[in-house]
Amino acid sequence: ECVTQLLKDTCFEGGDITTVFTPSAKYCQVVCTYHPRCLLFTFTAESPSEDPTRWFTCVLKDSVTETLPRVNRTAAISGYSFKQCSHQISACNKDIYVDLDMKGINYNSSVAKSAQECQERCTDDVHCHFFTYATRQFPSLEHRNICLLKHTQTGTPTRITKLDKVVSGFSLKSCALSNLACIRDIFPNTVFADSNIDSVMAPDAFVCGRICTHHPGCLFFTFFSQEWPKESQRNLCLLKTSESGLPSTRIKKSKALSGFSLQSCRHSIPVFCHSSFYHDTDFLGEELDIVAAKSHEACQKLCTNAVRCQFFTYTPAQASCNEGKGKCYLKLSSNGSPTKILHGRGGISGYTLRLCKMDNECTTKIKPRIVGGTASVRGEWPWQVTLHTTSPTQRHLCGGSIIGNQWILTAAHCFYGVESPKILRVYSGILNQSEIKEDTSFFGVQEIIIHDQYKMAESGYDIALLKLETTVNYTDSQRPICLPSKGDRNVIYTDCWVTGWGYRKLRDKIQNTLQKAKIPLVTNEECQKRYRGHKITHKMICAGYREGGKDACKGDSGGPLSCKHNEVWHLVGITSWGEGCAQRERPGVYTNVVEYVDWILEKTQAV
């Protein structure tokens, strides 16, 4: 059962796993959620009745029954992990904590103009977990405006104390705001020979890389495959670090693979979600339960639904035993990974999907693309919405894209003459406009946020956000698309599609069925040549065939230019403007979304 509210002046008795320090009960709850075993926690706030050494302690707890006895205690705040909840969760913490000194290893000290600059420095430093900044009112003259970058083994402070005129906060790497290099390559036949900070068992190098990504101290890893000559090291995932953040020595070794933490690009790839099945593989660990299941998929579902289950092994039924049901072994361990991995025993193993919600929903695999044809099928573009106006009569106005459970990204020019959000309706999960009847459910619009530098589509800043009145429950037919990561600016997208219900030629009508067209991106330089009378800025992106024939058109405005990269769809562009439709040597011009990621985050994450 999902319990989100915090219990004031309440302490959970027993079940302690470990104690960490966090600046707030809210962040303690996040730490508990990301810990492999924590189900409940007790946080101690600052209070005159409490020993100051216990202030800001966050005790992570576990319980077989998923609950613990409650005891009244002033200044204690208790609660449950979000593991039991189905909603999206994130480790991103933008809060700044005033008059708190978060202790850790101070490895870098420099002058900064503001706490924001200090936080940016921390975000762009590979080792930094959190920072403390001495403001210009700090009593000691030589420490004023000093920005201390800090790290610890756990990624959380070793202690937190009250200190006047300082502020502290966390790195925003987990908010996808880092400019650090994002290197996705996995290097075959390579061992990185740097110091190990931890080791876990993993079924493949991809899982090893994901574990490294969400381990606070891991910067790169080496994985020994099941063919590795030394038997005791097979399936071993070594989590590594170095002072420079780069591997100092690489050794050519067959059957080993190495790679980097993806902490600076984590929002465009699944990190927590290990969704594959591993055949002829047994995961060993502490047994939680043994249940009958029809298939390994059913076993994975059982594991996902059991809050304490971290991984499983399914043994298929022998002949006609047990109504064709096999045995499903639900398992757990102290770190969430198998304690040993064995091959050749006939088991099928995998991980809980409970942690998938810790990844951005947008990374979830969707239906395979239908090749050929121009009409879409249901669920093919689940982020696409149709925006209707009800004045003077109801009609399709523009396209848009779901980017969060309360947010639609669209074009600013769609709202010319729209006096109020009250006349707007957002329909999601729609394939045919004819599905929309009077009783079809829709999302009302609470607020229209138009970029304040927008004047007209052709001069740029053609971007707007719609805040919905109610939240979208994600399903196969309505789910978000990932925003491009700033770290992926160098990516050259080759699989891009424009979608919408717009005209199929310049003089036409709105289409009933959602249309799609695969369109190549065009360099801004090439695009500028085609639009001599306009300024094609870096905040615009162009797409189209030289010979024309496929393009967005009237009614597609505000809809997505969706590009697939590394198996994940990204919202690369917003349909904005163009000369005619699908004309020769006149590419479509789109708002270049990567250039507005900061603006989007600022608007959608504002308190």
């Epitope: 762009d124 590979v126 400019n179 290099a181 290097f187 953040g245 780069l246 690489r250």
Partner: nanobody
Framework: QVQLQESGGGSVQAGGSLRLSCAAS????????MGWFRQAPGKEREGVAA????????FYADSVKGRFTISQDNAKNTVYLEMDTLKPEDTAMYYC?????????????????WGQGTQVTVSS
């Protein structure tokens, strides 16, 4: 000690090409970030392209994407910048830089070793 030596600059007509080279000595360029930066008179130094030499991952500024290509030859300890379809606004002093740590690859303040620079002039 670490030394970076740029070469290959010169004058060229708009639309032309140049290939800049950066030879590194005093350290092995096999697991570093190497970057090309440029500075036009009266302007700030800006990142153009960078490469992680341990795996050839590349990073480009939007203004040069699709026109410039950064590459490496580990055997020669050299990084190259292939510049095609040059424009007058590409005119600047081009510097090679190296950082033997994990960094934001197009930020000049993150690099600790710098070359003397090579001039590129593009006339219309």
């Amino acid at each position: 000690q670490v030394q970076l030596q740029e070469s290959g600059g010169g004058s060229v007509q708009a639309g032309g090409s140049l290939r800049l080279s950066c030879a590194a000595s005093g350290f092995t360029a096999s697991s570093n970030f190497m970057g090309w930066f440029r500075q036009a008179p009266g302007k700030e130094r800006e990142g153009v392209a960078a490469i992680y030499t341990g795996g050839a991952s590349t990073f480009y500024a939007d203004s040069v994407k699709g026109r410039f290509t950064i590459s490496q030859d580990n055997a020669k300890n050299t990084v190259y910048l292939e510049m095609d379809t040059l424009k007058p606004e590409d005119t600047a002093m081009y510097y090679c830089a190296a950082a033997p740590r994990w960094i934001a690859p197009l930020r000049a303040d993150r690099y600790e070793y710098w070359g003397q620079g090579t001039q590129v002039t593009v006339s219309s």
